[in-house]
Interface confidence: low
Amino acid sequence: KEEQISFRDCAEVFKSGHTTNGVYTLTLPNSTEEVKAYCDMEAGGGGWTIIQRREDGSVDFQRTWKEYKVGFGNPSGEYWLGNEFVSQLTNQQRYVLKIHLKDWEGNEAYSLYEHFYLSSEELNYRIHLKGLTGTAGKISSISQPGNDFSTKDADNDKCICKCSQMLTGGWWFDACGPSNLNGMYYPQRQNTNKFNGIKWYYWKGSGYSLKGTTMMIRPADF
């Protein structure tokens, strides 16, 4: 009987010889739980596991804690891979995080963090980031030090308000902070002066809602 080959991330998929972009099944070591993730095998050398994508407003990102924990959406389109999987993955080895952004005028930019991991659910999937480079701002639009994750039903932010309810979407809100890539999707020409849109402050300012975003991770030693 042929042995079932499993991959923990898209870097392992890439190294096994699968170098085509697409949806692949990933499994954490010592686990039988599978997730479907989109692998970008072309950008910057390939091997990127996409953990978030916004592109057309086809998926509702105003979801519960549990939905953000397990993931939702369509890996071929808009989706969130799942905090639990990402937390476990990024605590097994060192990962980099690349955030790719598109505006409505045809411009693209990115932020690259040389070390990224999420704490466990007990610690509210707090985000940890180090070493920012890239073209989407010299200051991190994800508040540093990292914050706990908040959703519409889990208010873990540092504001007396409820950032997730006010700004929509689950995110590592501060009070409420300079970013929210899971905010409301606004179409072109409706995308300015929007406090609850898809925001990356240190690239486009506070009221600009982006056309597209991708969050991707890859082992630092890839």
Partner: antibody, heavy 117, light 107 residues
């Protein structure tokens, strides 16, 4: 090239129904809220209805004059937006234009709806 | 509902003239105002949005200004192809509303 092509207009008696269609091409239809705007003969422009995206639960808005009689819908798989018009009145006589997100950059050529006995 | 009161309802001008059309909103609409041009038998065309941003391909002789309740469309030097009807629109709140239109005719 962006194209919005309306169809379904025609002559209908008061109290009757019509369904207008608008086929979209040349842009990412799923990215855009879609609207209907009408223009009575020799008159100005009047906004009729809007439908948003799937992520907005296809939320709709209507002008007071058509609320409860008209229904806007969209089929993303067909890149088409519809306007179901029931209980039509003579004052609904107009050219009906399909447009994109306000402010309206993309317009169809219009389809004439005549409500007359 | 927000009323958009446009003036004048019509005007006569010559090629090369500077033309100004005003639009007054019944309540504050910020800068969520657009201007359209419409020729007989044709669909309207977007000229200006966000009160002052020219849409792609619109000649620089068209400009918009204003915020809050008072808005202006200016054609700096009227060209033969500019004879048409112009509408303002607010998209700040529902229902979306248009001004009554300004017909620009040849003097």
């Amino acid at each position: 090239e962006v194209q919005l092509v309306e169809s379904g207009g025609g002559l209908v008696k008061p109290g009757g129904s019509l369904r207008l269609s608008c086929a979209a091409s040349g842009f990412t239809f799923s990215n855009y809220w879609m609207n209907w705007v009408r223009q009575a003969p020799g008159k100005g422009l009047e906004w009729v209805a809007e439908i948003r995206l799937k992520s907005n639960n296809y939320a709709t808005h209507y002008a007071e004059s058509v609320k409860g009689r008209f229904t806007i819908s969209r089929d993303v798989s067909k890149n088409t937006v519809y306007l179901q018009m029931n209980s039509l009145k003579t004052e609904d006589t107009a050219v009906y234009y399909c447009t994109d997100t306000a402010p309206f950059a993309y317009w169809g050529q219009g389809t004439l709806v005549t409500v007359s006995s | 509902d927000i009323q958009m009161t446009q003036s004048p309802s019509s005007l006569s001008a010559s090629v090369g003239d500077r033309v100004t059309i005003t639009c007054k909103a019944s309540q504050d609409v910020g800068t969520d105002v657009a201007w359209y041009q419409q020729k007989p038998g044709k669909a309207p065309k977007l000229l200006i949005y966000w009160a002052s941003t020219r849409h792609t391909g619109v000649p620089s002789r068209f400009s918009g200004s204003g915020s809050g309740t008072d808005f202006t469309l200016t054609i700096s030097s009227l060209q033969p192809e500019d004879f048409a009807t112009y509408y303002c629109q607010q998209y700040s709140s529902y229902p979306l509303t248009f001004g009554g239109g300004t017909k620009v005719e040849i003097k």
